[in-house]
């Protein structure tokens, strides 16, 4: 007697590893014999598709070599013209051992920047990613984090972060290890011991001593009154990444002697300078304070930004503070030519006020740092996009000069005017497009180190920068 088809073995979920065989069974009882068709995600599987084998009158579907794209719902449909067609469905879950699709690569990074070591993985179940530094599992902390993607992010890279790293991807089916990569931390040249100034008698011998460090170890050159040292003997020694240079001089005239420490980071150089004056007793002139002194700004770049006749702090760790600081701003401003019109005035004000800091009264001249709120406003509001780009370029080493790194303050290390309004300097000359102004959105927080608090209103300072935001 004719009998409508009945599926006696419904399809079940099948787990299969990549490159293995997976079989679905769809046992059917009927008379006459049914026609059985198969679909994957509602798309008909063609009988002649060589990736599949259909046997036992269509009751067995075999995927000959499973790929991760074979995931889906498979259905068999049986029909013999008696009664209606019947269908049964089951899922194929493709399981996959972990595989590292984007392994980490060797990285050279400058101390204080952010390093990201990639480690993108595939696998089912999704692999968990951990990292090994040297021979030990790497512990995450406030600076070091494994991102959702598996990449390792190290904020504010320190010398001790240098070493060999590898990532480990693990799931229930196995473990994959990346190759070992090297993180090299480079450090800007820094002078540890500056040469000291001397007031000596004519014909004395003086030894100027300059010690510097950096990674790679810097070289030290000596400059006398702006030219390479022509007389005197130089002795150098290097120990534990510290270079020690001694310049012995026979004094017959006064002079300004500058120790310049230089090291190379890719195509760029970093330099640190320290100067000492040699004066002959009867020629002696008053010495400037060894940290710096206050003077009216006489440069050009920051003329429109700094208050007229403002006294600014000039740092005597530079041989010629006015020239060096002006060059620092000039270099940074060149990078600003491409930023948006909303960002540019804010960034210019930040750079000028950071490099030529306001002077504070007192026995010893001291600079007043920029208020954290203004720094954060520039970083997170006016120049959010540009700041990210700049950080990205910095990590990839695309800047022509290391100087711009010195010209961007680290906002979190600046005092907040919320706690002491006299501890820091405002940016009063951010004055751009006064039409159509709205209020700075309030983001006051009990932790101003993170959020940008309201900038207070005051008749004496205006901070109206963008067409969208203003701060007073």
């Amino acid at each position: 007697l004719p009998k409508a088809p009945v599926i006696t073995t419904p399809l079940e979920t099948v787990d299969a590893l990549v490159e293995e065989v997976a079989t679905f069974m769809c046992a059917v009882e009927s008379y006459p014999q049914p026609e059985i068709s198969w679909t994957r995600n509602k798309i008909l599987i063609k009988l002649f598709d060589t990736r599949y084998s259909i046997r036992e009158n269509g009751q067995l579907l075999t995927i000959l070599s499973v790929e991760d794209s074979d995931d889906g719902i498979y259905c068999c449909t049986a029909n013999n013209g008696v009664g209606g067609a019947v269908e049964s469905c089951g899922a194929l879950q493709v399981k996959m051992k972990p595989k590292i699709t984007r392994p980490p690569i060797n990285v050279k990074i400058i101390e204080g920047l952010k390093a990201v070591l990639p480690c993108t993985t595939m696998g089912n179940p999704k692999p968990s990613v951990s990292w090994i530094k040297g021979d030990s599992p790497l512990r995450e902390n406030s600076r070091i984090a494994v991102l959702e993607s598996g990449s390792l992010r190290i904020h504010n890279v320190q010398k001790e972060d240098a070493g060999q790293y590898r990532c480990v991807a693990k799931n229930s089916l196995g473990t994959a290890y990346s190759k070992v990569v090297k993180l090299e931390v480079e450090v800007f040249a820094r002078i540890l011991r500056a040469p000291e100034s001397h007031n000596v008698t004519f014909g004395s011998f003086v030894t100027l001593h300059c010690t510097a460090t950096g990674i790679p170890v810097p070289t030290i050159t000596w400059i006398e009154n702006g030219n390479a040292v022509s007389s005197g003997s130089i002795q150098e020694s290097v120990k534990d990444r510290v270079i020690d240079s001694r310049l012995q001089l026979f004094i017959t005239k006064p002079g300004l002697y500058t120790c310049i420490a230089t090291n190379k980071h890719g195509e760029k150089f970093s330099t640190a300078k320290a100067a000492a004056t040699i004066s002959i007793a009867e020629w002696s002139k008053p010495q400037k304070d060894n940290k710096g002194y206050c003077a009216q700004y006489r440069g050009e770049v920051c003329n429109a930004v700094l208050a007229k006749d403002a006294l600014v702090f000039l740092n005597t760790s530079y041989a010629d503070p006015e020239e060096a600081q002006e060059l620092l701003v000039h270099t940074a401003w060149n990078e600003l030519k491409v930023v948006s019109p909303v960002c540019r005035p804010a960034a210019e004000a930040l750079l000028c006020n950071h490099i030529f800091q306001e002077c504070s009264p007192g026995v010893v001249p001291t600079p007043i740092p920029i208020c954290r709120e203004y720094c954060l406003a520039v970083k997170e509001l006016f120049c959010a996009k540009e700041w990210l780009v700049m950080e990205e370029k910095t990590h990839r080493g695309l800047y022509r000069s290391e100087m711009h790194l010195l010209s961007v303050p680290e906002c979190s290390k600046l005092p907040s005017m919320h706690w002491d309004p006299t501890a820091c300097a405002r940016l009063p000359h951010l004055d751009y497009n006064k039409e159509n102004l709205k209020t700075f959105p309030p983001m006051t927080s009990s932790k101003p180190s993170v959020d940008i608090p309201n900038l207070p209103s005051s008749s004496s300072s205006s901070f109206s920068v963008s067409p969208t935001y203003s701060m007073t």
Epitope: C294, A307, D309, A310, L311, E358, C359, S360, P361, G362, V363, V364, T366, I368, K413, L414, P415, S416, W419, D420, P421, T422, A423, S446, S449, S459, S460
Partner: antibody, heavy 115, light 111 residues
Framework: EVQLVESGGGLVQPGGSLSLSCVAS????????MNWVRQAPGKGLEWLSV???????YYADSVKGRFTISRDNVKNTLYLQLNNLKPEDTALYYC?????????WGQGTQVTVSS | EIVLTQSPSSVTASAGEKVTINCKSS??????????LAWYQQRPGQSPRLLIY???TRESGVPDRFSGSGSTTDFTLTISSFQPEDVAVYYC?????????FGSGTRLEIK
């Protein structure tokens, strides 16, 4: 919220010593100048000392050589060491945050110098 | 050291009345376009509280009836409409040079 909590005051004999402490919270202590100011009973305010962010200290002439200000940025604590105390040092001693204006004040700790 | 002379030493006022307190410095406290002079209020039994810094900038949270003015050596604190809660001693202070110094104080009482 900034909090400055002074402690260490008490009764001491002339010529004696005391050490005052001020525990700061609610702000990044290391980034700010800190001061000590005192107020004798029924009298006005007298500034004593300031310490900057590099731990360079300045003093009023009346306490120079006898009092020492210091700070521990790890413990968020300001100190004032009082030596060779005199009866005229009797006062309420305040710990104050501020660079050129005295912005946030503690509640004070009482120092009494008497035989 | 810089000496600050405050006047008057005491003043009695009615609610709603305008009150002015003066502070004279023995030398200029003007530096880099700022006057380094501050005003404080000390209510009975309380710690002092900063009202005005840089001679004329009101500290956040201070009612706008308080204002500061003056430059170089002569400064004034004005309460435009005296309120009972303004009963206190008011001090001026210079932050121009160490040692920082205070005025002797002005006691403000209600009629």
């Amino acid at each position: 919220e900034v909090q400055l909590v002074e402690s260490g005051g008490g009764l001491v004999q002339p010529g004696g010593s005391l050490s005052l402490s001020c525990v700061a919270s609610g702000f990044t202590f290391s980034l700010y100048y800190m001061n000590w100011v005192r107020q004798a009973p029924g009298k006005g305010l007298e500034w004593l000392s300031v310490i900057d962010t590099h731990s360079i200290a300045y003093y009023a002439d009346s306490v120079k050589g006898r009092f020492t200000i210091s700070r521990d940025n790890v413990k968020n604590t300001l100190y004032l060491q009082l030596n060779n105390l005199k009866p005229e040092d009797t006062a309420l001693y305040y710990c104050v945050l501020g660079r050129t204006a005295l912005v946030r004040w503690g509640q004070g700790t009482q120092v009494t110098v008497s035989s | 050291e810089i000496v600050l002379t405050q006047s008057p030493s005491s003043v009695t006022a009615s609610a709603g009345e305008k009150v002015t307190i003066n502070c004279k410095s023995s030398q200029s406290v003007l530096y880099n376009q700022k006057n380094y002079l501050a005003w404080y209020q000390q209510r009975p039994g309380q710690s002092p509280r900063l009202l005005i810094y840089w001679a004329s900038t009101r500290e956040s949270g201070v009612p706008d009836r308080f204002s500061g003015s003056g430059s170089t050596t002569d400064f004034t604190l004005t309460i435009s409409s005296f309120q009972p809660e303004d009963v206190a001693v008011y001090y001026c202070q210079q932050g121009y040079s160490v040692p920082y110094t205070f005025g002797s104080g002005t006691r403000l009482e209600i009629k």
